[in-house]
Structure formats: structure tokens, C-alpha cells
Amino acid sequence: ELCDDDPPEIPHATFKAMAYKEGTMLNCECKRGFRRIKSGSLYMLCTGNSSHSSWDNQCQCTSSATRNTTKQVTPQPEEQKERKTTEMQSPMQPVDQASLPGHCREPPPWENEATERIYHFVVGQMVYYQCVQGYRALHRGPAESVCKMTHGKTRWTQPQLICTGEMETSQFPGEEKPQASPEGRPESETSCLVTTTDFQIQTEMAATMETSIFTTEYQ
């Protein structure tokens, strides 16, 4: 059920998962000069029941005299059962935080973690795309990608987003950060026919613009 590849890259766009499906694993990686504590967890695992999801395990890094050479690990299901549960939600989250059943939020930062987080996504995971600052969406369809299972293989759908290089500080109304809400996406596809639907680019431009409350400056 793990997704084989990373989500697709779109020129001049960035993507983010707003929540992580149960079964997602996050490697406990430390930045250079630090390593996982002895007997520390190799990964965090999003687990839960019908009413609540949370991250099992807690990543911890400690100073290291030698460079951390631990390999990235994709744990096997048997290993997962032996892990103890540690609640990793921030105690200072505003009360209106979005909550998607069957999903975990981004784990809070841990001390001296690696710059990049390495996630092992599961089928059904969705990531959302936006044009980076200085670019705007020219042709837009769903600016998202979903990991799907087809013919026993996983693939990420192609986000229908093109970012053009015209400097633009305004945003389309549809470019708000998605709220975590049930998507009702199928976790597998029964048909062997792969259509071009995921790859068709919509050519309609948004007719209205919405001024952002943010402006940007590059140092």
C-alpha cells in the first residue's frame, strides 16, 4: 500500500500534504552532527481509529561526534506493531485546527531534525500544489495529486497546474490553502483503462482575482 514514487514536480510550483493518511511513515532523520538517540525510534507512524489519529513514536536526535550514517528505513509491518505510542500534537494549536478523520497532522518539529523530511506515503494520499511567489496559475485544473493503485502498481495523478513567470502578487480565489476535509477519493482503481483525464489541462482562466494580504520581499 506504500506509494512507490514521489509526487510529481511541477515547474515553479511547490506542493505540500496538509494531512497524512494512516499508515504513513516518517523517517527519524537528524541533521549533520546529530544522530538518533540509542534505542530511539527509526520512524514515526500515523495510526488511529475511526475517531482519532496520531503519530506513534517520537523522533529524538542527540549530538554525535561522528557523522550519522544510519540508512533510511522503510519498516516492515511486523516492526510497526512493537512501537509504543506517543502523542505528537502541539499543545498550543488553536482550537479551530482542521481535523480530517483517518489522517494525522504534520508532526511538530523536533530538535536538530534533518532539513528534509522523508515520508513514505500510502495509497490515497493527496498533496496540494501552488505556484511559488512570483508566478501565477495560468491554466488551472485540480492543483492536487493523489497516489492511486492501478494494475497493482502505484502512481501519482498529474496535477493540472501551469505556473507562468509573470510577477503577480494576487491570488485566484481557488488558491486558498485547502481545509482538511473528507475527499471521498477511491483508494484503488478497478479499471485497467488509464484515461487521459488526469493529464488534460483546463484552459479556462479564473475570471476574478483576489488581493492577497501578503506581499513579498526577497532579501
Epitope: 479551530d96 511567489q133 486558498e176 526577497y218
Partner: nanobody, 130 residues
Framework: QLQLVESGGGLVQAGGSLRLSCAAS????????IGWFRQASGKEREGVSY????????FYADSVKGRFIISSDNAKNTVDLQMNSLKPDDAAVYYC???????????????????????WGKGTLVTVSP
């Protein structure tokens, strides 16, 4: 667990200046957007400014642009907010917050929303007298 600790709040006259600081010992700055929200009494928490810890790009709410300056010292793990020409409307509790960067170390302003932050400080009070 890693904590964010704000300091520098206080009472200032309109037109005056304050410098807020957020200490985030142990935070890997180049993996996060780090910045500030504020919440005035009876109002919703709103984004003020943030800095991309990877590329140093900065973002400001229109209401503070030209008056506030955000900066970071990655070696000291601090982010400062220099607030000039303060107005009574700037009075609020100011919260430090962090959010993971997106792919390629990029971050967009629509992500800087209270429900989506990964970690919050406890806040520091800024009072501006007329």
C-alpha cells in the same frame, strides 16, 4: 519537545518602536517558515509576517508593510520582528509560530494560516497607548 519562546512585548506609545524576539533552540530553521501572528482582544488570530528559513524570503501583511521588519539569526535560532511606527491597532498578543516548508524549500503566503501551524509559542503582549 521543542518550544518557541517569545520576548520583547510591552507598553509603548503610538509612533514608538518595539522589537520582538522568538527563540527556537534546536529548530532546524532551513526546514521551516518562521514568523508571527497576532490576536487582539475579541478578534481572530491573524498573520503578521514570516520568513522562509531556507531562502530568507519575507512576507508581510498589508497592514504592517513598511513598518515592520522580520529577520532571522539561524546561528542563534532566533527570529526578530522590529515594529516601528506602532499604532493602537497593533496592540495584541503576538505569537511566534512555525510551519514546514513545501517541496523544494518553497513557501506560499496562503499557507500562513493559524489552523495549519506546526508549533506555537505562548505569546507576548504588545500594548500601544494613543
Amino acid at each position: 519537545q521543542l518550544q518557541l519562546v517569545e520576548s520583547g512585548g510591552g507598553l509603548v506609545q503610538a509612533g514608538g518602536s518595539l522589537r520582538l524576539s522568538c527563540a527556537a533552540s534546536g529548530l532546524t530553521f532551513d526546514g521551516y517558515a518562521i514568523g508571527w501572528f497576532r490576536q487582539a482582544s475579541g478578534k481572530e488570530r491573524e498573520g503578521v509576517s514570516y520568513i522562509n528559513g531556507r531562502d530568507g524570503s519575507t512576507f508581510y501583511a498589508d497592514s504592517v508593510k513598511g513598518r515592520f521588519i522580520i529577520s532571522s539569526d539561524n546561528a542563534k535560532n532566533t527570529v526578530d520582528l522590529q515594529m516601528n511606527s506602532l499604532k493602537p491597532d497593533d496592540a495584541a498578543v503576538y505569537y511566534c509560530a512555525v510551519d514546514r516548508l513545501g517541496s523544494r524549500g518553497a513557501y506560499v503566503s496562503t499557507w500562513w494560516r493559524p489552523p495549519d501551524m506546526d508549533l506555537w509559542g505562548k505569546g507576548t503582549l504588545v500594548t500601544v497607548s494613543p
